[in-house]
Interface confidence: low
């Protein structure tokens, strides 16, 4: 019943499907008679003999230039020409498992495999590749203020996996050598706050200093890291004696 010239449909003579059914769903043969398993990405389709088959949803059968070795089939262009199933959308996508898949079809196939193993289904989180090193979305800004004031530095970072954000105070020693001190340390007038967002895989952190003292002056570094890399940005806190010493850029006020 699966020959290229269709005779009467005789379901009894159809080859059996696997006893557990088809991983990517069922289709019918060229004659619309026998049930067959839909083919996955990279699998043979459209040919004669073992190569005959139809692609799963979201895929199309693209004829290959040269026939697969050992496959029956007519001359090039004929009904027996074999092809392979390829994804209609051929851009990489990021799965909810944190893996980048070359196509949405491969993600769907991975999801079905996961579900068949009793794991959670994998969904598409975004188009494009998945894991990326941290980058600074909004760096901290330099601050000038008087002793006793309440000031804060903020830093917004993004990365996949979501980065870990820490703050350091950069101390410059002799000959330009620098070392960092992890904040908050044992300083009572300083607090660190971190929260997720505003976007997915983003983290925003703050250093709050209150009251500001001369010892708090210096360079503060926001440092983000994940499995893919690290990024940092810094800003200076300058402590002045009086408000009139704070330089005001045109159109800007001091951050109080």
């Amino acid at each position: 019943s699966s020959s290229d010239t269709c005779g009467p449909c005789e379901p009894a003579s159809c080859p059996p499907l696997p006893p557990l059914g088809c991983l990517l769903g069922e289709t019918r043969d060229a004659c619309g008679c026998c049930p067959m398993c839909a083919r996955g990405e990279g699998e043979p389709c459209g040919g004669g003999g073992a190569g005959r088959g139809y692609c799963a949803p979201g895929m199309e059968c693209v004829k290959s230039r040269k026939r697969r070795k050992g496959k029956a089939g007519a001359a090039a262009g004929g009904p027996g020409v074999s092809g392979v199933c390829v994804c209609k959308s051929r851009y990489p996508v990021c799965g909810s498992d944190g893996t980048t898949y070359p196509s949405g079809c491969q993600l769907r196939a991975a999801s079905q495999r996961a579900e068949s193993r009793g794991e959670k289904a994998i969904t598409q989180v975004s188009k494009g590749t998945c894991e990326q090193g941290p980058s600074i979305v909004t760096p901290p800004k330099d601050i000038w203020n008087v002793t006793g004031a309440q000031v804060y530095l903020s830093c917004e970072v993004i990365g996949i996996p979501t980065p870990v954000l820490i703050w350091n105070k950069v101390k410059r020693g002799h000959y330009g050598v620098q070392r960092t001190e992890l904040l908050p340390g044992d300083r009572d007038n300083l607090a660190i706050q971190t929260r997720g967002g505003p976007e997915k895989h983003e983290v925003t952190g703050w250093v709050l200093v209150s009251p500001l003292s001369k010892e708090d002056a210096g360079e503060y570094e926001c440092h983000a890291s994940n499995s893919q890399g690290q990024a940092s940005a810094s800003a200076k806190i300058t402590v002045v004696d009086a408000l009139h010493e704070i330089p005001v850029k045109k159109g800007e006020g001091a951050e109080l």
């Epitope: 080859p15 696997p18 006893p19 557990l20 991983l23 398993c37 083919r39 996955g40 990279g42 699998e43 043979p44 073992a50 088959g53 196939a109 495999r113 068949s116 193993r117 009793g118 794991e119 959670k120």
Partner: antibody, heavy 121, light 110 residues
Framework: QVQLVQSGGGLVQPGRSLRLSCAAS????????MHWVRQAPGKGLEWVSG????????GYADSVKGRFTISRDNAKNSLYLQMNSLRAEDTALYYC??????????????WGQGTTVTVSS | QSVLTQPPSVSGAPGQRVTISCTGS?????????VHWYQQLPGTAPKLLIY???NRPSGVPDRFSGSKSGTSASLAIAGLQAEDEADYYC??????????FGGGTKVTVL
Amino acid sequence: QVQLVQSGGGLVQPGRSLRLSCAASGFTFDDYAMHWVRQAPGKGLEWVSGISWNSGSIGYADSVKGRFTISRDNAKNSLYLQMNSLRAEDTALYYCAKDISGSQLVLLDYWGQGTTVTVSS
Amino acid sequence: QSVLTQPPSVSGAPGQRVTISCTGSSSNIGAGYDVHWYQQLPGTAPKLLIYGNSNRPSGVPDRFSGSKSGTSASLAIAGLQAEDEADYYCQSYDSSLSVVFGGGTKVTVL
């Protein structure tokens, strides 16, 4: 109906090699992943190796990694297991088995009759 | 020693109900991986009996049933028959070892 006919087993000395074959029929061989599972005398089942429909994905149990090589010839509907540096503990009945999918779910719906490998000096 | 633990043997009279347990850990059954069961009649190759914890392939009698809870799974045979005398193996996946089988349970019909 689905048939998996195995050959290549036998008695071999430690350190020597052996190649097992599994001839498949009754299903579209190049649609499915295939596996080797072994059973030592009087013992339970142990998965040895698996290969996806297009040989793009291959896996081995730690106990055979680096010594055994799985391969397939879709044109000949055949599965192979090349076993090198054989040890006494490799003595077992080796089964070839068909997966339910093209990728390696390791859910085995059809099994061969088994072929015996005895490693002894 | 097998990663999945099964009792070495269970027995029952014809018509009785027997249960075989398969105990794993948080890295296999407890991690959410499916459990499959195989039946091996004396002198024959294993045969798939239950897949995906509780599903029966066509041709498997409905007296065989499977279930899973937490880090363990079980196979029940209701109305034990003489032809059920065989070895039964559970199989799952392990995040470190990939494919894992239980040690097997011999079912004897008294």
